[in-house]
Interface confidence: medium
């Protein structure tokens, strides 16, 4: 079957990194600079992706594979194949569509990306709050209130966190 196909279509013999050049009697020609073909039998080579601006080159383009980009420091990838670079925020913040916003009371984010998450509710596990939560850190749960020595005060459990995902106005 392969031999029959080759007789019918000489282009099928052209390997990755080349293209079937109709201007030269369907000879397999190497891809020109800054272009590639990742599969055999192609009639054109694709233009290499250029990683410019906030994008930086993670993998150079070769004759058989496209360049791969990632993001410069202060940004992180979003979308298939890092098609976009989303800005990092500080710890204690989250990135909304309108930019970096501080975590609301009762929530925290210990990373430079992602969203603010509610503090752990220690009382659900029958424990008390040993260390209060902050915008950057979750609460630390300690022993259950019954285990505390007389006179020791437990910290008030955190207020329930707000539901994320309201419409931007």
């Amino acid at each position: 079957f392969e031999r029959t196909r080759s007789l019918q279509d000489p282009c099928s013999n052209c390997p990755a990194g080349t293209f079937c050049d109709n201007n030269r009697n369907q000879i397999c020609s190497p891809c020109p600079p800054n272009s590639f073909s990742s599969a055999g039998g192609q009639r054109t080579c694709d233009i290499c992706r250029q990683c410019k601006g906030v994008f930086r080159t993670r993998k150079e383009c070769s004759s058989t594979s496209n360049a791969e980009c990632d993001c410069t420091p202060g940004f992180h990838c979003l979308g298939a194949g890092c098609s976009m670079c989303e800005q990092d925020c500080k710890q204690g913040q989250e990135l909304t569509k309108k930019g970096c916003k501080d975590c609301c009371f009762g929530t925290f984010n210990d990373q430079k990306r992602g969203i603010c998450r509610p503090w752990t509710n220690c009382s659900l596990d029958g424990k008390s709050v040993l260390v209060n939560g902050t915008k950057e850190r979750d609460v630390v749960c300690g022993p259950s209130p019954a285990d505390l020595s007389p006179g020791a005060s437990s910290v008030t459990p955190p207020a329930p966190a707000r539901e994320p995902g309201h419409s931007p106005q």
Partner: nanobody, 124 residues
């Protein structure tokens, strides 16, 4: 397979207009909010505009308010971005995105599908 295909980008003069289109396929279009975002060459992602699944509610970033208009045609499975009074700082790759619900959210994690983008260049 869910797909979004943007078109309508190009080179335009300062103060000119362009209309971007985003053709959607592979899902029940009217059930989901849609969003336009953009990426300028030296900047991070910037949210531009969002529209609810019904088309009744629209939202705009401060930098485009009064100049850009988002709309959708649910019979054609297409969302549009009409861009007027274009400025040099509007030069960017514009991406169309599908959100996970009929109403739009504050966060990019509400987005589950991105288009490949269309380039808009505003020249003086």
């Amino acid at each position: 397979e869910v797909q979004l295909l943007e078109s309508g980008g190009g080179l335009v003069q300062l103060g000119g207009s362009l209309r971007l289109s985003c053709a959607a396929s592979g899902f029940t279009f009217s059930r989901y909010a849609m969003t336009w975002v953009r990426q300028a060459p030296e900047k991070g992602l910037e949210w531009v505009s969002s529209i609810s699944g019904s088309g009744d509610d629209t939202y705009y970033g401060d930098s485009v308010k009064g100049r850009f208009t988002i709309s959708r045609d649910n019979s054609q499975n297409t969302v549009y971005l009409q861009m007027n009074s274009l400025r040099a700082e509007d030069t960017a790759v514009y991406f169309c995105a599908k959100e996970k619900a009929g109403t739009t959210g504050d966060y990019y994690y509400n987005v589950d599908v991105w288009g490949q983008g269309t380039t808009v260049t505003v020249s003086s």
